[in-house]
């Protein structure tokens, strides 16, 4: 009874379409298939970034795979064939690993990398990226950014680039068509007459990093003798109310009464006959059924009653700024 | 099934030019890889060029600067224009295509019988 075995796939590689850190891991079919013509092979293929202590595993009857990485690291990868059980008499035959590594050979020490990067989607409509210069890098040094997410051709880079002292220290970044819900991949590189520059990558996904406009159009309703309600309106733009958590801060008479997480526009406040003064702010932020993470909003302008009747039905004041 | 059939090998002295062609017929419902690949006897085949997923082109080895890897997808067709030829590009050059039968719900991958480039020295 002779053993079966199987020849591990052929050509193994990762290809860089220049995504800035989507890749394609591809293979061809192993040789001396012909046994098995009738059966449908299998691949097990495990990759992660160098450092990482998990492989990711796909198990596939396809010739590639696409995913993203962070090219700030190596990336390594390992693929062997399986036989189904159903090829082999009831025992599924593994080749052995065929492996392949991928990296950018890094120019420029690391301290010339672009420092403190941080991006904020406002309102789920502008995205504005920022930036400090590397360490000890001269005024020659400018920073270009380049950007990827699935949908478009290839890598763009930054039109409207935000400046300081003539080096580019961040970026405007134009309308953004079907961006949302899948990673978007950020290459800022470098170039100076001096010494080269490190590249530094980043990937995020930009429903994660919305700040959104604070709430607008404060006002009070009395409910009942004791109760008195709180609303306002979710801002302009494009972000849908079901997409809001509210903290709302209110002072009574000059002390704190309440802060309260609320998921919407509404909220109802027990109050007392003695009270002489409220006021409350709210701010808001995309919550967990829109996004993975977000950032608070600042908060509203204040509103304000002060000095009249609370048991009034509908009390609106002027807007005083929060501070 | 499906057929792959190279032309434009031959006999071409060092530094001249050849353009090989592959056309692809058969039931075939996507084309998703076109790449050449070399073969010298007693030798592993080694892959020359590619076009793969999203366009992308990549070159291997000493063809790259001197090779230029196209296809034009209305034909089912890919072409690898060689250019500085040299003895060592002596070899058998076949076509692969990855991709997807009409009757088929995976990938699969397809061999032209390759065509003869000689680069006498």
């Known amino acids: 009874d002779t053993e079966i075995k199987v020849n591990p796939p052929q050509d193994f590689e990762i290809v860089d379409p220049g995504y800035l850190g989507y890749l394609y891991l591809q293979w061809q079919p192993p040789l001396s298939l012909d046994h098995f013509k009738e059966c449908t092979v299998e691949y097990e293929l495990k990759y992660r970034n160098i450092g990482s202590e998990t492989w990711k595993t796909i198990i596939t009857k396809n010739l590639h795979y696409k995913d993203g990485f962070d090219l700030n690291k190596g990336i390594e990868a390992k693929i062997h064939t399986l036989l189904p059980w159903q090829c082999t008499n009831g025992s599924e035959v593994q080749s052995s690993w065929a492996e392949t590594t991928y990296w950018i050979s890094p120019q420029g020490i690391p301290e010339t990398k672009v420092q403190d990067m941080d991006c904020v989607y406002y309102n789920w409509q502008y995205l504005l990226c920022s930036w400090k210069p590397g360490i000890g890098v001269l005024l020659d040094t400018n920073y270009n950014l380049f950007y990827w997410y699935e949908g478009l051709d290839h890598a763009l880079q930054c039109v409207d680039y935000i400046k300081a002292d003539g080096q580019n220290i961040g970026c405007r970044f134009p309308y953004l068509e079907a961006s949302d819900y899948k990673d978007f991949y950020i290459c800022v590189n470098g170039s100076s007459e001096n010494k080269p520059i490190r590249s530094s990558y980043f990937t995020f996904q930009l429903q994660n990093i919305v700040k959104p406009l604070p709430p607008v159009y404060l006002t009070f309703t009395r409910e009942s003798s004791c109760e008195i309600k709180l609303k306002w309106s979710i801002p302009l733009g494009p972000i849908p109310a079901r997409c809001f958590d509210y903290e709302i801060e209110i002072r009574e008479d000059d002390t704190t009464l309440v802060t309260a997480t609320v998921e919407n526009e509404t909220y109802t406040l027990k109050t007392t006959n003695e009270t002489r003064q409220l006021c409350f702010v709210v701010r808001s932020k995309v919550n967990i059924y829109c996004s993975d993470d977000g950032i608070w909003s600042e908060w509203s302008d204040k509103q304000c009653w002060e000095g009249e009747d609370l048991s009034k039905k509908t009390l609106l004041r002027h807007h005083h700024h929060h501070h | 099934q499906v057929q792959l059939q190279e032309s434009g090998g031959g006999l071409v002295q060092p530094g001249g030019s050849l353009r090989l062609s592959c056309e692809v017929s058969?039931?075939?419902?996507?084309?998703?890889?076109m790449a050449w690949y070399r073969q010298v006897p007693e030798k592993e085949r080694e892959m020359v060029a590619q076009i793969t997923y999203g366009d992308t082109i990549k070159y291997y080895g000493s063809a790259k600067g001197r090779f230029t890897i196209s296809r034009d997808s209305a034909k089912n067709a890919v072409y690898l224009q060689m250019n500085s030829l040299k003895p060592e590009d002596t070899a058998v050059y076949r076509c692969?295509?990855?991709?997807?039968?009409?009757?088929?719900?995976?990938?699969?991958?397809?061999w032209g019988q390759g065509t003869q480039v000689t680069v006498p020295s």
């Open positions: 058969g039931s075939i419902f996507s084309i998703n890889r």
């Open positions: 692969n295509i990855v991709g997807v039968l009409t009757t088929g719900h995976y990938e699969d991958s397809f």
